[in-house]
């Protein structure tokens, strides 16, 4: 039985040209994490393994960092990268869990709005 | 003056499928999500899912995956969203209302259509 | 998915009251930046529904300023310092920091 739960940073609205950190975590339960994968929509952005670390997809590696911990950077951020992004943890032995993280990003100059963005 | 204009009432058939269409104007189109909302009974809403369609990017409420396909087509300023194998259970009123850039809020809405499923 | 709660489920009104309408959520609404993407929507009989309140206390466009919004976390709150006709309707907190964006049950501000 899949006990897990998900808990990720939420939403983001960020600024074009910036970066944001996409973060999950999973509690309560003591399956062993084997790798997680992030993707967005469906494309693979990167995964990391628990015995081979990290991959970076070739398209992405520019943009993309690994970390901090099972997160992912994302940087100099386009308005193109606006989408959902997908944390799946793969486990044993519970299976699959998957967090869902929404990004939205921004023309700089809506930020005369009043929108806090966050721009690490 | 930003307007959301959506297409009339339907009466449909259980196990029928439907679309829904959503014409914007008045702002940049592309720039803004688009999302649709659900409400039963004449009270409870429900978030079904969003498009952006800059880059056609969607998110769904994992409860409408099957049911509900979200599209758009830039050069008219449409989205629509599509309801799939109707039930009596779909009966409702469905919005479209477009994204408050920086605050995932609701910030204008359509009229709303009627949606009816009924043999 | 986050349980949006609101209460009272009905709130019986005179004109000139000040009221409070709280939404609870099940998990906190702060994103790992610090903002928090909770609104209220008013939804009047025969309209569609509008926005009120954004990002917990910004009032949108048009909005009068007897409305009014706080809170933090998992306790948010809107309040109406002077009851008017127009205010009657259908009240609804939303979310949209966690996917699924997900509604309160809505709240009944009626007439005494």
């Known amino acids: 039985m899949m006990t897990g739960t998900i808990e990720t940073t939420g939403n983001i609205s960020a600024e074009k040209g910036g970066s944001i950190i996409l973060q999950c975590h999973l509690s309560s339960t003591t399956a062993q994490v084997t790798q997680v994968n992030w993707e967005q929509q469906d494309q693979l952005l990167a995964i990391c393994n628990a015995d081979l670390g990290w991959h970076i997809s070739p398209s992405f590696k520019d943009r993309v960092a690994p970390g901090p911990g099972l997160g992912l950077t994302l940087q100099s951020l386009t308005v193109n990268d606006t989408g959902e992004y997908f944390c799946i943890y793969h486990t044993y032995p519970d299976g699959t869990y998957t967090g869902r993280i929404f990004l939205e990003v921004l023309e700089s100059s809506v930020a005369e709005h009043g929108a806090r963005f966050q721009i690490p | 003056e930003v307007q959301l204009q959506q297409s009339g009432p339907e009466m449909v058939k259980p196990g029928a499928s439907m679309k829904i269409s959503c014409k914007a104007s008045g702002y940049s189109f592309t720039g803004y999500t688009m999302n649709w909302v659900k409400q039963s009974h004449g009270k409870n809403l429900e978030w079904l899912g969003l498009i952006f369609p800059y880059n056609s990017a969607t998110s769904y409420n994992q409860k409408f995956t099957g049911k509900a396909t979200i599209t758009v087509d830039k050069s008219s300023n449409t989205t629509y969203m599509e309801l799939l194998s109707l039930t009596s259970e779909d009966s409702a009123v469905y919005y479209c209302?477009?994204?408050?850039?920086?605050?995932?809020?609701?910030?204008?809405w359509g009229q709303g259509t009627s949606v009816t499923v009924s043999s | 998915d986050v349980v949006m709660t609101q209460t009272p489920l009905s709130l019986p009104v005179s004109f000139g009251d000040q009221v409070s309408i709280s939404c609870r959520s099940s998990?906190?609404?702060?994103?790992?930046?610090?903002?928090?993407?909770l609104s209220w929507y008013l939804h009047k009989p025969g309209q569609s529904p509008h926005l009120l309140i954004y990002?917990?206390?910004n009032r949108f466009s048009g909005v009068p300023d007897r409305f009014s919004g706080s809170g933090s976390g998992t306790d948010f709150t809107l309040k109406i310092s002077t009851i008017k006709p127009e205010d009657l309707g259908m009240y609804y907190c939303?979310?949209?920091?966690?996917?699924?964006?997900?509604f309160g049950g809505g709240t009944k501000l009626e007439i005494r």
């Open positions: 998990q906190s609404l702060a994103n790992s930046y610090g903002n928090t993407y």
């Open positions: 990002g917990i206390s």
């Open positions: 939303l979310q949209g920091t966690h996917q699924p964006w997900t």
């Open positions: 209302a477009r994204g408050l850039r920086g605050f995932f809020a609701l910030d204008y």
